[in-house]
């Protein structure tokens, strides 16, 4: 009888080890998906339409490397601009490098000329820190050139080849960004 109990205990322990392993695998999977959240979201939202359309970017979006960009044709305040982008499975533009900044400003020159376009930068009014919406800080070369004197919330925008700041409640065009879908050829 003692041997039977011992065997059952060993089986239970083995089962527990397997469950712990499964949990660890799930945790790892969850973490890796969180790291790729932007891409995961873009993939899920676009996978159905990509069955009919093999283009890496939707119609009226511009591609550069792994990103798709949409330049709005309407004005809105910063918060509404971000909401508009989110509805499209994207976010307001997050400029990662000088190369990306150059591509954006070059494209804007061709499309529309020298207007103001909201990007995904906002400034914490208490600490003065600039943050992209994923929480990262812009690289030193991509900090808005002028600090707005507004007592209100301040957000970042692109004009010509500069990154500037303004009251978030002013109306501007905006630029959305999402990951380009990889072609499955």
């Amino acid at each position: 009888k003692l041997l039977q109990v011992s065997t059952i205990a060993m089986q239970q322990q083995e089962k527990l080890i397997q469950q712990e392993r499964a949990l660890l695998n799930f945790t790892e999977w969850k973490r890796s998906c969180a790291l790729q959240m932007k891409y995961c979201q873009a993939f899920m939202q676009n996978s159905l339409s990509s069955a009919h359309n093999s283009s890496p970017c939707p119609n009226n979006w511009i591609q550069n490397r792994e990103s798709c960009y949409y330049v709005s044709e309407i004005w809105s305040i910063w918060h509404t601009s971000q909401e508009n982008c989110l509805k499209e499975g994207s976010t307001l533009l997050q400029i990662e490098s000088k190369e990306e900044m150059d591509f954006i400003t070059g494209s804007l020159r061709k499309i529309k000329g020298s207007y103001d376009y909201w990007v995904g930068l906002s400034q914490d009014g208490h600490s003065g820190r600039w943050l992209w919406q994923d929480g990262s800080s812009p690289s030193p070369g991509l900090l808005p050139a002028e600090r707005s004197q507004s007592a209100n919330q301040v957000c970042g925008y692109v004009k010509s080849n500069s990154l500037l700041s303004s009251n978030c409640s002013t109306w501007k065009y905006f630029i959305c960004e999402k990951y380009a879908l990889r072609s499955s050829v």
Epitope: A34, Q82, E83, L86, L131, Q133, D134, G135, Q153
Partner: nanobody, 112 residues
Framework: QVQLVESGGGLVQPGGSLRLSCAAS????????MSWVRQAPGKGLEWVAS????????SYTGSVEGRFTISRDNAKNTLYLLMNNLKPDDTAVYYC?????RGQGTQVTVSS
């Protein structure tokens, strides 16, 4: 419209812990940096911590670094602030904030 409702404050002894929550509605919570700020009696608003839209890049003001942990659950549209090893200096009304918009706040009092 944006609505933020803070809860979880209370009276706690020095060295104790509290977890604040902030229920968000009226906007796409998962798309924005969120912050906690506080206002101590007779003082101005002070930034405490921020977290990125997907839960990355948490950052803290120096005085709470290592004691407070900011986190978020985008499925529940909720922001959290876990406060450990509380000190009398942490006594304040705590607000969660999104783009300059705040809720009504929750009072945290640290006293023996």
């Amino acid at each position: 419209q944006v609505q933020l409702v803070e809860s979880g404050g209370g009276l706690v002894q020095p060295g104790g812990s509290l977890r604040l929550s902030c229920a968000a509605s009226g906007f796409t919570f998962s798309g924005y940096v969120m912050s906690w700020v506080r206002q101590a009696p007779g003082k101005g608003l002070e930034w405490v911590a921020s977290i990125g839209s997907g839960g990355g890049y948490p950052s803290y003001t120096g005085s709470v670094e290592g004691r407070f942990t900011i986190s978020r659950d985008n499925a529940k549209n909720t922001l959290y602030l876990l406060m450990n090893n509380l000190k009398p200096d942490d006594t304040a009304v705590y607000y969660c904030e999104m783009l300059g918009r705040r809720g009504q706040g929750t009072q945290v009092t640290v006293s023996s």
